[in-house]
């Protein structure tokens, strides 16, 4: 095959080699870019910057080598469009630093930086950590900082990510209230900060205020849906990123729903309870307190992480006619009470039949509607007791 006269020549089925001295000053318009998995660049003194736009369209790229060239700066978002990159060799260039953001989100198996005039600073603390933890083949390179000695010996006591403190109201928050959150950011070299509010949806009207080092967030006209939702403050500096999440507890009265008994392996009277704080529960059977035992007890399903409602069953093991009757679930928290009742018939009474009738042996649950009581004002004389903690 005739030698390739171009700046960049195909290499294998999906590779490209660019090795002709000084032929490139950027990576725009590389031939066949969208299918490239390997890109090898050498001896390109004019290639000094690597930026987001340079690698746009290289979505399949897995191996990138830029060696013995003039690379002085790699943008923090340079590899945003190459999420599959696993090997990155930037050795023997003019790099003094490389941001932690550059490699964030990549699963690099190999990162080669030897032969660069690295400048030891907190901005390379992440690389020092890679060396300590044996990541990316970094330890084997014995990286040196230009005129400062080994990277491994760089003092790092003051190299910390930002420290965040989020102040939340300690007073009770009610539905309809406005809530002010404040995020205090401390640390050296602060670059950016903000709020992540993706979980909030319709839980409140959001207004942001202030900037570094003190960010404000007003959640106006909050709803009970705000409970269990994360409000996250984040901040970045040259060392890394810190996040702190808080949740705002919005008080609302207890509510309860009961459903028709169903036969699973054992019988289950399904229920749902809601409220903040989590209500205490109590069962009545035919108007009397039902004490839980291993044969009749409350069992909760695994709670969803982002909601206050709890679902569960009153479990009954092999109930007979003596268990037929009216089941009431009482729920109470400091903001209100609610109750719901349901009739359940698990088995006909074998002692109540006409001698001429066949003896009934089948299980036959009665299909009755549940009555879900609205939250009511708490009255002292209501016979509530602490039985079941829902939270």
């Amino acid at each position: 095959a005739a030698p390739c006269p171009d700046a960049c020549c195909p290499h294998g089925s999906s590779g490209l080699r660019c090795t002709r001295d000084g032929a490139l000053d950027s990576l725009h318009h590389l031939p066949g870019a969208e299918n490239l998995t390997e890109l090898y660049i050498e001896n390109q003194q004019h290639l000094q910057h690597l930026e987001l736009r340079d690698l746009r369209g290289l979505g399949e790229l897995r191996n990138l080598t830029i060696v013995k060239s003039g690379l002085r700066f790699v943008a923090p978002d340079a590899f945003h469009f190459t999420p599959r990159l696993s090997r990155l060799n930037l050795s023997f260039n003019a790099l003094e630093s490389l941001s932690w953001k550059t490699v964030q989100g990549l699963s690099l198996q190999e990162l080669v930086l030897s032969g660069n005039p690295l400048h030891c600073s907190c901005a390379l603390r992440w690389l020092q950590r890679w060396e300590e933890e044996g990541l990316g083949g970094v330890p084997e390179q014995k990286l040196q900082c230009h005129g400062q000695g080994p990277l491994a010996h760089m003092p790092n006591a003051s190299c910390g990510v930002p420290t965040l403190k989020v102040q939340v109201p300690n007073a009770s928050v009610d539905v309809g209230d406005d809530v002010l959150l404040r995020c205090q950011v401390e640390g050296r070299g602060l670059e950016q900060a903000g709020w992540i509010l993706t979980e909030l949806e319709q839980s409140a009207t959001v207004m942001k205020s202030g900037g570094l080092p003190s960010l404000g967030l007003t959640l106006a006209n909050v709803t009970s849906d705000l409970n269990r939702k994360n409000v996250t403050c984040w901040a970045e500096n040259d060392v890394g990123r810190a996040e702190v999440s808080v949740q705002v507890n919005v008080s609302f009265p207890a509510s309860v729903q009961l459903h028709t008994a169903v036969e699973m392996h054992h019988w289950c009277i399904p229920f749902s309870v809601d409220g903040q704080p989590a209500p205490s529960l109590r069962w009545l059977f035919n108007g009397s307190v039902l004490n839980e035992t291993s044969f009749i007890f409350t069992e909760f399903l695994e709670p969803a992480a982002n909601e206050t409602v709890r679902h569960g069953c009153l479990r009954l093991n092999q109930p007979t006619h003596v268990n037929n009757g009216n089941y009431t679930l009482l729920a109470a928290n400091p903001f209100g009470q609610a109750s719901a009742s349901i009739m359940a018939a698990f088995m006909d009474n074998p002692f109540e039949f006409n001698p001429e009738d066949p003896i009934p042996v089948s299980f036959s649950p009665v299909d009755t509607n549940s009555t879900s009581g609205d939250p009511v004002e708490k009255k002292d004389e209501t016979p509530f007791g602490v039985s079941v903690a829902v939270g």
């Epitope: 839980e292 035992t293 291993s294 007890f297 092999q318 003596v322 039985s387």
Partner: antibody, heavy 117, light 109 residues
Framework: QVQLQQSGAELMKPGASVKISCKAI????????IEWVKQRPGHGLEWIGE????????NYNENFKGKATFTVDISSTTTYIQFSSLTSEDSAVYYC??????????WGQGTSLTVSS | QTVVTQESALTTSPGETVTLTCRSS?????????ANWVQEKPDHLFTSLMG???NRAPGVPARFSGSLIGDKAALTITGAQTEDEAIYFC?????????FGGGTKLTVL
């Protein structure tokens, strides 16, 4: 597989307190009741009570209220029974057993308690 | 206080069928009593055999079966084996507590 491992034999003085443990292995500890049973020669088996580890709900035999107290450590999947004001009547072998919706299915190996001055 | 009564001792031969019973002083035993049967072998080795009157516990051989016979709970061993020699306890549930029987010493000669 499911196992209940009980603590070793105890020799106690009258008036003292003692705590016996029952470590659960091989199943979701919080979801099954643990039963406690007393065995004395010539007295057969006596049910002390039960506890649901996940929620700490307890149910005691009237005869043991004030004598026995159940506790749970979820992190170590261990249930405890504590006896107070020990007398010679408390000398016995104590068993924990798992209850599967009421029915016994697995038993511990027993812990012997001797109360003697 | 309810008393639960069992035969104090029974003797059977290998291959024979033997039935152990469990009576309640407070009336007929019903499914509401959730009769449980437990086997004790030497060195305090307890094994659950039967729950809920007739539900065999995990790993229990099919020769063991539970039932209600008349006003009593019963454990039947169909084709007894020498390793079945043990003490058998029944337990009955009364709304919120268990009461154990005194145990039946089964000898398989």
């Amino acid at each position: 597989q499911v196992q209940l491992q009980q603590s070793g034999a105890e020799l106690m003085k009258p008036g003292a307190s003692v705590k016996i443990s029952c470590k659960a292995i091989g199943y979701t500890f919080s979801r099954y009741w643990i039963e406690w049973v007393k065995q004395r020669p010539g007295h057969g088996l006596e049910w002390i009570g039960e506890i649901l580890p996940g929620r700490g709900v307890t149910n005691y035999n009237e005869n043991f209220k004030g004598k026995a107290t159940f506790t749970v450590d979820i992190s170590s999947t261990t249930t405890y029974i504590q006896f107070s004001s020990l007398t010679s009547e408390d000398s016995a072998v104590y068993y924990c057993a798992r209850s599967n919706y009421g029915d016994y299915d697995f038993w511990g190996q027993g812990t012997s308690l001797t109360v003697s001055s | 206080q309810t008393v639960v009564t069992q035969e104090s001792a029974l003797t059977t031969s290998p291959g024979e069928t033997v039935t152990l019973t469990c009576r309640s002083s407070s009336g007929a035993v019903t499914t509401s009593n959730h009769a449980n049967w437990v086997q004790e072998k030497p060195d305090h080795l307890f094994t659950s055999l039967m729950g809920g009157t007739n539900n065999r516990a995990p790993g229990v051989p099919a020769r063991f079966s539970g039932s209600l016979i008349g006003d009593k709970a019963a454990l039947t061993i169909t084709g007894a084996q020498t390793e079945d020699e043990a003490i058998y306890f029944c337990a009955l549930w009364y709304s919120n507590h268990w009461v154990f029987g005194g145990g039946t010493k089964l000898t398989v000669l």
